[in-house]
Interface confidence: medium
């Protein structure tokens, strides 16, 4: 197995068993040691091998590390001499007592914990042992506690997030891989609570959003709705321009890997009869040689329950690719689970996904993350296959990605049938711009046309950013009591022709809010169009209207250029 050093493994053929001394072996020889050969060595010999691997900085595979650790039966004395990543596979219980455990964890927290998937038993036993060794009582942590845990801090359960949000949230931001459900819920609750270090979402700035980077996928709708809209828009605009925000393309099989695993016979007794836990101990080439692709395809639903390494998942994907070069059948796609994250958009373009259940199953895997290129391609394939965005599809997509609707172009939105509008929730329109609402509003009007006044207003309210003047005038006759937030989202050109009386009727008791908004569009522009004595009837102290005795000439060209009406004095 070639390591990251780019070295190729040299055949060993028993060389470990009897060289004059292991440290005389070259990195190329050390790189290729098979587990079977290590099994025959004495503990002392294994320790010698481990030290030599560390000295020569040989990068080992997960299987090799697991195998070495298994053979180091007694806890090694000189931890500093062993490969750092090997320690992840040692049992922390072997280092009991404050002195031994402190030595052990002072090294472990500098290792790359992410060599082990979250569910791996070796990883799951590290955190409790580290907490006990460091002396943590309860769930309250200091900044120093979090730093001492290194990469293990990413595994701290939700109760720690809840009690130590101030010091833990900034750490979770940079954790690789998704947080689990428990952590996500706790992080969401802490962010919504508005405590330190980020404060209430209503006070967030673009730099807060930057600082939250890795936690943005866990923000629920209530939080997103609380962030000032301008901030969200500015941040989205910036992050779409910044290439560092784009997810790196998920790794696909490299040519070297293909050469390495091809044409190798399965060792006797290793042929897989079913997809089960025993396969996690198979090397990559063994998986390739011993697992039948057709068996894998029929038992795909089992793969997710087994803690395969990322390298092993690469092999399984490779097997499916060979079995289905034209694209996977839906029976396999539906059960891909976490293997879906290994797919490239090119892979997905070969699929024909028609079942909503399949779509849901794959969206579930990506849940809590921003829409990846893979997911975008999947949705595109699904919607194109259906011909239009029907209600069930829209329901599903907006449940997973509340901003989905607003990510479509006005042209794409025009294919949404009015019947699907019933699936749209107010929060799904939060990030839509006026051009999108211009398309959606007439559809909503059509969809809700048979509802009575107050019910109609509740449904249509979030679409009103696309409403024309005549519809706003009609609403003003229906005692709807529009709130200021909705009024501020109306099209300026639709608001300008409204009279003071019409705005007063439209807003009802909320009319008092105009004073706070008098410097902002559309209120500012509307005030400039009203006679001052009409504005005075509201008793709000609104200023900037047309003085009494002045004529307003509709010289639309001049007005368009200056942004204000043309006035002639008495």
């Amino acid at each position: 197995l070639a390591g990251e050093t780019g070295q190729e493994a040299a055949p060993l053929d028993g060389v470990l068993a009897n060289p004059p001394n292991i440290s005389s072996l070259s990195p190329r020889q050390l790189l290729g040691f098979p587990c079977a050969e290590v099994s025959g060595l004495s503990t002392e010999r294994v320790r010698e091998l481990a030290v030599a691997l560390a000295q020569k900085n040989v990068k080992l595979s997960t299987e090799q590390l697991r195998c070495l650790a298994h053979r180091l039966s007694e806890p090694p004395e000189d931890l500093d001499a062993l490969p750092l990543d090997l320690l992840l596979f040692l049992n922390p219980d072997a280092f009991s007592g404050p002195q031994a455990c402190t030595r052990f964890f002072s090294r472990i927290t500098k290792a790359n914990v992410d060599l082990l998937p979250r569910g791996a038993p070796e990883r799951q036993r590290l955190l409790p042992a580290a907490l006990a060794c460091w002396g943590v009582r309860g769930s309250l942590l200091s900044e120093a506690d979090v730093r001492a845990l290194g990469g293990l801090a990413c595994d701290l359960p939700g109760r720690f997030v809840a009690e130590s949000a101030e010091v833990l949230l900034p750490r979770l931001v940079s954790c690789p891989g998704p947080l689990d459900q428990d952590q996500q819920e706790a992080a969401r609750a802490a962010l919504q609570g508005g405590g330190p270090p980020y404060g209430p979402p209503s006070t967030w700035s673009v730099s807060t959003m930057d600082a939250l980077r890795g936690l943005l996928p866990v923000l629920g709708q209530p939080i997103i709705r609380s962030i000032p809209q301008g901030i969200v828009a500015a941040w989205r605009q910036r992050s779409s321009r910044d290439p560092s925000w784009r997810q790196p393309e998920r790794t696909i099989l490299r040519p070297r890997f293909r050469r390495e695993v091809e044409k190798t016979a399965c060792p006797s007794g290793k042929k897989a009869r079913e997809i089960d836990e025993s396969l996690i101990f198979y090397k990559k080439w063994e998986l390739e040689a011993c697992v039948d692709a057709a068996l894998l395809a029929t038992q795909m639903d089992r793969v997710n329950a087994i803690p395969f390494t990322y390298e092993q998942l690469d092999v399984l994907k490779h097997k499916l690719d060979e079995l289905y070069p034209q694209g996977y059948p839906e029976s396999v796609i539906q059960h891909l689970g976490y293997l879906f994250l290994k797919m490239s958009p090119e892979d997905i373009r070969k699929w024909n996904v028609t079942s909503l259940e399949t779509l849901k199953a794959l969206l579930e895997v990506n849940k809590g993350h921003e829409m990846s290129p893979q997911v975008a391609t999947l949705i595109d394939r699904f919607v194109k296959g259906r011909g239009q965005l029907d209600k069930d599809t829209l329901d599903t997509l907006t449940a997973f990605y509340p901003g989905y609707l607003c990510s479509l172009s006005p042209e794409e939105l025009s294919s949404v049938p009015p019947s699907s509008i019933w699936a749209v929730r107010p929060q799904d329109l939060d990030t839509c711009d006026p051009r999108q609402l211009d398309v959606l509003y007439p559809k909503a009007r059509l969809a809700f046309q048979n509802m009575n006044g107050s019910e109609y207003f509740v449904k249509i309210q979030s679409f009103l950013g696309g409403a024309p003047t005549e519809d706003l005038k009609a609403l003003s006759q229906q005692n709807v009591s529009m709130d200021l937030a909705t009024f501020m989202k109306l099209r300026t050109d639709a608001v300008l022709p409204l009279t003071v009386a019409e705005v007063q009727k439209l807003l009802g008791p909320h009319v008092e809010g105009l004073k706070a908004e008098e410097r902002h569009r559309p209120v500012r522009d509307w005030i400039l169009r009203q006679r001052q004595d009409d504005l005075d009837t509201l008793g709000l102290g609104l200023q900037g209207g047309i003085p009494n005795g002045y004529l307003v000439l509709d010289l639309s060209m001049q007005e368009a250029l200056s942004g204000t009406p043309c006035l002639l004095g008495p």
């Epitope: 402190t102 002072s106 460091w134 900044e143 120093a144 506690d145 730093r147 001492a148």
Partner: nanobody, 122 residues
Framework: QVHLVEAGGGLVQAGGSLRVSCAIS????????LGWFRRAPGKEREFVAL????????WYEDSAKGRFTISRDNAKNTVYLQMNSLKPEDTAVYYC???????????????WGQGTQVTVSG
């Protein structure tokens, strides 16, 4: 920032005792360990002892075991190093350092004091 000031150094006879102190101010919650180090003339800086805030766990280098005791006074935000049975080879500048991590790597210590001179006469 964290600020550390050592005190209590001086001249002492071999076999005698001395207590050096390290007063800590600033953002102490951002540190989890405090260590004592020493540098003898013409020698490398060497680790002597450390104490961990979370559980008052103390650790001593072999040369300090049984003779030195590290302790802390939370109320005064001060850490002490009580040195008994002093030997001429204990002569050095003693530094206190604070940081995060487990304390066994020099890189775990982000903040250092100016040092206090301890001289043990034969």
């Amino acid at each position: 920032q964290v600020h550390l000031v050592e005190a209590g150094g001086g001249l002492v006879q071999a076999g005698g005792s001395l207590r050096v102190s390290c007063a800590i101010s600033g953002r102490t919650d951002s540190t989890g360990i405090l260590g004592w180090f020493r540098r003898a003339p013409g020698k490398e800086r060497e680790f002597v002892a450390l104490i961990r805030w979370s559980n008052n766990y103390a650790w001593y280098e072999d040369s300090a075991k049984g003779r030195f005791t590290i302790s802390r006074d939370n109320a005064k935000n001060t850490v002490y190093l009580q040195m008994n049975s002093l030997k001429p080879e204990d002569t050095a500048v003693y530094y206190c350092a604070a940081g995060t991590g487990w304390g066994f790597s020099i890189s775990d210590y982000n903040y250092w004091g100016q040092g206090t001179q301890v001289t043990v006469s034969g």
